[in-house]
């Protein structure tokens, strides 16, 4: 019993004088609170309380319930307890079969004993079953069995109180303990796509998955920069313990224009948050962009060839898609195909392979592509560069010597001089006319050029040249000159 | 023996809200999980959702979403559910029962309140 | 949601028969489900949870089995105390009951 110095108030006195007295069942409970100042007497067994106004606590007819804490207390708030075991073979323990415990932390396995001097005081699997090899437990009459650290894998274990009551083992009712799971990382989030292009008015529908190992996750879907509650729906699986899922899925089910912007999914745990984004585009119509993967004027070379590819952004997704020359819609020799497989891909290629190109291929090619809301094209200037071909070398009647050529680009015309037998006809001529034939014809194709000299001028005999070139080659025609007494006679010209 | 222990019948006017609580006597309240079903006359049990109150985060039924909340209070081992914007359809008896969440079974349950929704 | 399918929605039985409750579950739920017993006036109580696990103070005479889509409770030897309503419950996703079977003296 406790003592204190004279003159302060000091916790009442209980008879008997025990901390702990062991009753048989059936025998009286008699306990007695002395104390000038007595208030109340308390009992306490398995969260269950009892009070009694009276100084003398008599229970006529124990029963093993009545095992528990009996506190005496004074107008002071001072007390003193016994504890009082009713021993009853046929009532070992008192149970309150609710067992839950929390990762880690631990938890008690509410089985008080209602006599102490039994052995063996411990937990034993139901069925015969063992414990598990690394659970830990710590006895104590009057409250329990204590497990240690709680882990995750006694979720739903079912276990008993044993202990020896003259030589034989009795176990109490069962027990299955609830684990409740720590949260040890930030919960999984994931979003069904990471981009959303819309027309105004079609639906907007996004599913944030949120995986953790309870269902007591917070989640939410939120507008960045805004705090308007969004509508979500929820679906959630429990696919083993630990293992929860939850979808929430946002709808707008018309979306406007001013709907465009990000979406994020927050989760959040005791761990700690995670979050992922989506982000939602919408405009008002559909739409191509046409983006030239090569220059849009190309200059290629008789006989090589060019691929002319085209890279374009479309939303719905096209349509049709054709390439077109000189009116005449080609059915081969092209390709379309997506930029990516991703379902949100807008972005597509288109190519046209142009091969052995000849000088009369020249021209405009024009992909066209559409979908439901819009058209568009973009056109190539397709040159084919060619060597120049001299078409005529002629004597003409009033003596002067002329020499047409074609080819891209705009061939020149020089000519030479070679006197006598030699074989470099170093000597140029100027030309008295050079004209463009065709310059106000088609853009495309070859360019014609006519040069023409004056014969009289050469006294001698000898060869003439007619040199026509351009970027890509040359080509020359010549003209033979004898003189015969006076008389000037041209021989036949030849390449 | 751990009890729930519900509050007394109510008689709502539609359009109105009603707090139902329920309180635990004993046990590890905070890591309980309580949920809250319901019963309209002559018909089936409906879960509407629950809560483990260690965590705070309450889990509702698709059906009850934006129209119920649960809550708990750790320090005097009490649940709460309230619903709002009452209709007649809601007239039913209100059960707290323990379990409900993360697979837990319905253990233990309250004796149920009876909510009135009338003009 | 997972629905709950329960039948019969009723039936009459004498005190001694057995008795057989099925419930199917519109999806796969592997073995959380739980079966209750309600008497007019009283709240439910649970007599089988994970599909087949006895709860304690529940006579042996009850019993549950399944797994899946397709569970049984079953009632070895009918006792006077046993006519009610049973419930079974499914805890993988939103929780959901069966439609209920009421029990009735034949």
């Known amino acids: 019993q406790p003592s204190v110095s004279p003159g302060e108030p000091s916790p009442p006195s209980i008879h008997p004088a025990k901390s702990e007295l062991i009753v048989r069942v059936g025998n009286e409970i008699r306990l007695l609170c002395i104390d000038p100042g007595f208030v109340k007497w308390t009992f306490e067994i398995l969260d269950e309380t009892n009070e009694n106004k009276q100084n003398e606590w008599i229970t006529e007819k124990a029963e093993a319930t009545n095992t528990g804490k009996y506190t005496c207390t004074n107008k002071h708030g001072l007390s003193s307890s016994i504890y009082v075991f009713v021993r009853d073979p046929a009532k070992l323990f008192l149970v309150d079969r609710s067992l839950y415990g929390k990762e880690d932390n631990d938890t008690l396995v509410r089985c008080p004993l209602t006599d102490p001097e039994v052995t063996s005081y411990s937990l034993k699997g139901c069925q015969g079953k063992p414990l598990p090899k690394d659970l830990r437990f710590v006895p104590d009459p009057k409250a329990g069995i204590t497990i240690k650290s709680v882990k995750r894998a006694y979720h739903r274990l079912c276990l008993h109180c044993s202990a020896d009551q003259e030589g034989k083992s009795v176990l109490s009712d069962k027990f299955i303990l609830k684990v409740r799971p720590a949260f040890k990382a930030v919960p999984v989030v994931s979003v069904s796509k990471a981009s959303y292009l819309l027309r105004e008015g079609e639906e907007f529908t996004v599913t944030c998955t949120i995986k953790d190992v309870s269902s007591s996750v917070y989640s939410t879907w939120k507008r960045e920069n805004s705090q308007t509650k969004l509508q979500e729906k929820y679906n959630s699986w429990h696919h083993g313990d630990f293992n929860y899922e939850r979808q929430a899925t946002l709808t707008i089910s018309s979306a406007r224009v001013n709907d465009s912007g990000v979406f994020m999914c927050y989760a959040n745990n005791t761990f700690g948050s995670a979050n992922v984004t989506t982000t939602l585009e919408v405009v008002d119509k559909g739409f191509i962009n046409i983006f030239p993967m090569i220059n849009t004027t190309v200059f290629v070379n008789d006989g090589e060839n060019v691929d002319l590819i085209v890279e374009y952004e479309a939303f719905p997704k096209p349509e049709h898609q054709q390439w077109i020359y000189m009116n005449r819609t080609f059915t081969d020799k092209w390709e379309d195909y997506p930029k990516s497989e991703n379902e949100s891909n807008i972005r597509y290629v288109s190519e046209l392979h142009l091969t052995r190109l000849k000088g009369t291929e020249g021209g405009t090619y024009t992909f066209l592509v559409s979908n439901s809301d819009v058209n568009a094209s973009i056109a190539f200037n397709v040159y084919v560069n060619t060597k120049p071909e001299i078409l005529t070398y002629d004597r003409l009647v009033n003596g002067m010597l002329q020499c047409v050529a074609a080819g891209f680009p705009e061939p020149t015309i020089d000519w030479y001089f070679c006197p006598g037998t030699e074989q470099r006809c170093s000597a140029s001529v100027l030309p008295v006319d050079v004209q463009t034939l065709n310059a106000s014809g088609p853009p495309f194709g070859k360019l014609v050029v006519q040069s023409s000299i004056d014969s009289s001028a050469f006294k001698h005999n000898g060869t003439v040249e007619c040199k026509a070139y351009n970027d890509v080659g040359k080509t020359s025609a010549y003209f033979n000159f004898a003189f015969k007494g006076n008389n000037k006679e041209q021989i036949h010209p030849h390449t | 023996q751990v009890q729930l222990v519900q509050s007394g019948a109510e008689v709502k006017k539609p359009g109105s809200s009603v707090k139902v609580s329920c309180k635990a006597s004993?046990?590890?309240?905070?890591?309980?999980?309580i949920s809250w079903v319901r019963q309209a006359p002559g018909q089936g049990l409906e879960w509407m959702g629950g809560?483990?109150?260690?965590?705070?985060?309450?889990n509702y039924a698709q059906k009850f979403q934006g129209r119920v909340t649960i809550t708990a209070d750790e320090s005097t081992s009490t649940a709460y559910m309230e619903l709002s914007s009452l209709r007649s359809e809601d007239t039913a008896v209100y059960y707290c029962?323990?379990?409900?969440?993360?697979?837990?079974?319905?253990?233990?349950w309250g004796r149920g309140t009876l909510v009135t929704v009338s003009s | 949601d997972i629905q709950m399918t329960q039948s019969p929605s009723s039936l009459s039985a004498s005190v001694g028969d057995r008795v057989t409750i099925t419930c199917r579950a519109s999806?796969?739920?592997?073995?959380?489900l739980n079966w209750y017993q309600q008497k007019p006036g009283k709240a439910p109580k649970l007599l089988i949870y994970?599909?087949?696990s006895l709860q304690s103070g529940v006579p042996s005479r009850f019993s549950g089995s399944g797994s899946g889509t397709d569970f049984t409770l079953t009632i070895s030897s009918l006792q006077p105390e046993d006519f009610a309503t049973y419930y079974c419950?499914?805890?993988?996703?939103?929780?959901?009951f069966g439609g209920g079977t009421k029990v009735e003296i034949k």
């Open positions: 029962a323990r379990g409900g969440l993360d697979t837990d079974e319905f253990d233990l």
């Open positions: 004993g046990g590890t309240f905070r890591i309980y999980a």
């Open positions: 809560i483990i109150p260690d965590f705070g985060v309450a």
């Open positions: 999806q796969s739920i592997n073995s959380y």
């Open positions: 994970a599909a087949s």
């Open positions: 419950q499914q805890g993988v996703s939103d929780i959901t």
